[in-house]
Amino acid sequence: MDSFNYTTPDYGHYDDKDTLDLNTPVDKTSNTLRVPDILALVIFAVVFLVGVLGNALVVWVTAFEAKRTINAIWFLNLAVADFLSCLALPILFTSIVQHHHWPFGGAACSILPSLILLNMYASILLLATISADRFLLVFKPIWCQNFRGAGLAWIACAVAWGLALLLTIPSFLYRVVREEYFPPKVLCGVDYSHDKRRERAVAIVRLVLGFLWPLLTLTICYTFILLRTWSRRATRSTKTLKVVVAVVASFFIFWLPYQVTGIMMSFLEPSSPTFLLLKKLDSLCVSFAYINCCINPIIYVVAGQGFQGRLRKSLPSLLRNVLTEESVVRESKSFTRSTVDTMAQKTQAV
């Protein structure tokens, strides 16, 4: 949320909603950090530890299975997106500790804070892809029998990553460093050069493409899936479905504060009390969104324990059990009508 706004007396840091105020500069006169910043630091530290270790473990578990298990491909890509974002955390942490001073240079300013947005778009696009996969397994099992394969899954992931990179470009392009003098520091933020319309456009696109549209489509998608699942009283394990629903729900929960404050700030006058209050909460909103980068491994472990009854297995084998379950789609391309009927019933609960 970091824009250099030309009229704000306090500024943003590193993600991309606020506007660096180039005219009325920062008021950071206390040695002690604000409470929201302290909370953000605590969250960043936890997210980094859990996110790096947890996602590394998920990558390790799923990488071996990705050749043969489509679910492993989905979870592998989600973990890579989260792991990448976590790598920026030590830098962002250091910047907050130094009252948002950015001594890391212009290239780092463009790239590192943009990683969380890349993560946002990559995650939601991958979740949309996974959700489409769940939908097809339930409603088009014969199509899945014929066409659902690892190659197609990897192509879908590549498209998701490509679109995510494309959608992150505005943040990357508008991000600049600038020197501040009272007190002396370098700030990293987004500079919309007085263009409030452009700032609003970026915020609206981010809200719609990164939040509202996915929320609507995925809600509809899972409503259909769950209704079909319950109506068929499927006996098959709903393990993967439950995990995916939990991952999707957590995405929207943790991105909500960031999106709400971002859209509000783009429409508020930078000198307004509400804007200044939201500015102070900026780091906290970013850190809250960053929880997405460590929550998935936690969901997988909790889900694994739930399915096992209690934690009897080692962590890798528990994760493997959750993440690499293959949906009931036969390998053979030749099947009878009865096989299809049986399979259609079995896949209701996927």
């Epitope: 009325t24 008021d27 950071k28 006169t29 040695n31 020197e179 003098y181 009272f182 007190p183 002396p184």
Partner: antibody, heavy 116, light 107 residues
Framework: DVQLQESGPGLVKPSQSLSLTCTVT?????????WNWIRQFPGNKLEWMGY???????SYNPSLKSRISITRDTSKNQFFLQFNSVTTEDTAKYYC?????????WGQGTTLTVSS | DIQMTQSPSSLSASLGEKVSLTCRAS??????LSWLQQKPDGSIKRLIY???TLDSGVPKRFSGSRSGSVYSLTISSLESEDFADYYC?????????FGGGTKLEIR
């Protein structure tokens, strides 16, 4: 070594507009830092007026924002302070200074007297 | 705006004497404070920045310190060229403001 030198009209009448010039030698005003105007009133009180940064970004003291403007001529390595309408209250000695970590280099100052 | 209260406003001292000037900030300025020296000809020179860091070329007899919101400039042994006006300046936020000054005179 960085050197700053102010120049101005010296004496002006109230309501007139004027421009003060700061010429910088030994350092490019587009390299880094902020280039400031500060004034000292007859009672010795000092007041920061504003700056133009190396990138051209401008910041003013809110108490003066509507009355002054700071510009620069990078080809001559100069920056300027313009008043649109002076009053007798603007009688002071005007200094230009560089800010990097506080104000590290100062000019000698130029005295401006506003009198009818 | 942050108010910088400087004391004393004037001080008479002898050569070789040790003197201290103080500056109190009305709000936290986190050590973003400079001490400036203004000679009788009007020229201004920075002596100290970041509360206690000596500028290059400034004699070691000058030192800066901080105790809470009170900042001090100490001259350990006065020399003839030290008799001048001294100002503190904070640059912790906008606008930077100056102390009222201390006139250091020879006794």
């Amino acid at each position: 070594d960085v050197q700053l030198q102010e120049s101005g009209p010296g004496l002006v009448k109230p309501s007139q507009s004027l421009s003060l010039t700061c010429t910088v030698t030994g350092y490019s005003i587009t390299s880094d830092s902020a280039w400031n105007w500060i004034r000292q009133f007859p009672g010795n009180k000092l007041e920061w007026m504003g700056y133009i940064s190396y990138s051209g970004r401008i910041s003013y003291n809110p108490s003066l924002k509507s009355r002054i403007s700071i510009t620069r001529d990078t080809s001559k390595n100069q920056f300027f302070l313009q008043f649109n309408s002076v009053t007798t209250e603007d009688t002071a000695k005007y200094y230009c200074a560089r800010a990097s970590i506080g104000f590290d280099y100062w000019g000698q100052g130029t005295t401006l007297t506003v009198s009818s | 705006d942050i108010q910088m209260t400087q004391s004393p406003s004037s001080l008479s001292a002898s050569l070789g004497e040790k003197v201290s000037l103080t500056c109190r900030a009305s709000q936290e300025i986190s050590g973003y404070l400079s001490w400036l020296q203004q000679k009788p000809d009007g020229s201004i020179k920075r002596l100290i920045y970041a509360a206690s860091t000596l500028d290059s070329g400034v004699p070691k007899r000058f030192s800066g310190s901080r105790s809470g919101s009170v900042y001090s400039l100490t001259i350990s042994s006065l020399e003839s060229e030290d008799f001048a006006d001294y100002y503190c300046l904070h640059y912790a936020n906008y606008p930077p403001t100056f102390g009222g000054g201390t006139k250091l005179e020879i006794r």
